[in-house]
């Protein structure tokens, strides 16, 4: 079951509480009524698990990727899992920890020694899950070694948003991923209504910037569900 799988990996796949190591004994939640606050639980033990649901790798931390915790397990259940270290098996780049990338199903180092000039590598990009590409074929993309050492500008090839400069995110463009601008107020955004629908986009948009959310444009409320236009709007 999902519980047993997650319990078996509880500490491995969880961050330590703020301000302490995992399992640090500690204090209760603040007594102030009706207040949310950072790390309110920071010294609580984590013998239990705290799965963080996701639909895309970008929703997880830089040391994580988004996937189903069990093969053949709960269909559609995806959570953030700890990244794979060097020489571990992988199916896509985001599964490998920072400083590594997925090559021939194995996480390998992406340091200078492995990138003399430009190299050609296979990006097996997964669209919506761990096990498939859009049409079942790998796409070959030329990656520059520079992208692993400087933050990518708009249009630069990337593996994850942390590869991109501030104000940019890593989003799909055809069968590679490039740095695109985070959406600003009033810009059209994509609202994923169906589970896994983000996997069908070959021209993926970034998410809305801080303080904005993707909502139906006011004058489109009467439109049919399928034609509703969503834009980034202030709360």
């Amino acid at each position: 079951t999902l519980n047993s799988v997650l319990n078996s990996n509880a500490i491995k796949n969880l961050p330590p509480p703020l301000g302490g190591a995992a399992g640090h004994p500690g204090s209760a939640v603040s007594a102030a009524p009706g207040i949310l606050y950072p790390g309110g639980n920071k010294y609580q033990t984590i013998d239990n698990y705290q799965p963080y649901p996701c639909a895309e790798d970008e929703e997880c931390g830089t040391d994580e990727y988004c996937a189903s915790p069990t093969r053949g397990g709960d269909a559609g259940v995806q959570i953030c899992l700890a990244c794979r270290k060097r020489r571990k098996r992988c199916m896509r780049h985001a599964m490998c920890c920072p400083g590594n990338y997925c090559k021939n199903g194995i996480c390998v180092s992406s340091d200078q020694n492995h990138f003399r000039g430009e190299i050609e590598e296979t990006i097996t990009e997964s669209f919506g899950n761990d096990h498939s590409t859009l049409d079942g074929y790998s796409r070959r993309t030329t990656l520059s070694s520079k992208m692993y050492h400087t933050k990518g500008q708009e249009g630069s090839v990337c593996l994850r948003s942390s590869d991109c400069a501030s104000g940019l995110c890593c989003a799909r463009h055809f069968w590679s991923k490039i740095c695109k601008p985070v959406l600003k107020e009033g810009q059209v955004c994509t609202k994923h209504r169906r589970k896994g629908s983000h996997g069908l986009e070959i021209f993926q948009r970034c998410y809305c910037g801080e303080g904005l959310s993707c909502r139906i444009q006011k004058d489109h409320h009467q439109a049919s569900n399928s034609s509703r236009l969503h834009t980034c709007q202030r709360h």
Epitope: L14, C54, G61, V77, Q78, H192
Partner: nanobody
């Protein structure tokens, strides 16, 4: 300071339903996963359910699967927990939690960094 307005807790008979809501203000939660946890007397706090920022991905504890439904309304900055077919063992203090936004906010691990004050749910037999 982030304010959290919670409602929906209370006393209910076994087999009954309750809906918890957790509305946040003062910080943008639309980009973060949100979850519900609970703590019964003398027990550790346990995970109940969580939902990602867009609502496209949800995860449930085995003990509540098929009975509880988590949902969210980003326009209202609110997350809901619909609890049906309640059992006496569901009796606990229920907590709402918000995530940190993961790598998009510079974090190495996606985690629940913001926790709310609990609301009591009591299921009588």
């Amino acid at each position: 300071e982030v304010q959290l307005v919670k409602s929906g807790g209370g006393l209910v008979q076994a087999g009954g339903s309750l809906r918890l809501s957790c509305a946040a203000s003062g910080r943008t939660f639309s980009s973060y996963a949100m979850g519900w946890f609970r703590q019964a007397p003398g027990k550790e706090r346990e995970f109940v359910a969580a939902i990602n920022w867009s609502g496209s991905s949800t995860v449930y504890a085995d003990s509540v699967k098929g009975r509880f439904t988590i949902s969210r309304d980003n326009a209202e900055n609110t997350v809901y927990l619909q609890m049906n077919s309640l059992k006496p063992e569901d009796t606990a203090v229920y907590y709402c939690a918000a995530g940190n936004g993961g790598r998009n906010y510079g974090h190495s691990r996606a985690r629940y960094d913001y926790w709310g004050q609990g609301t009591q749910v009591t299921v009588s037999s």
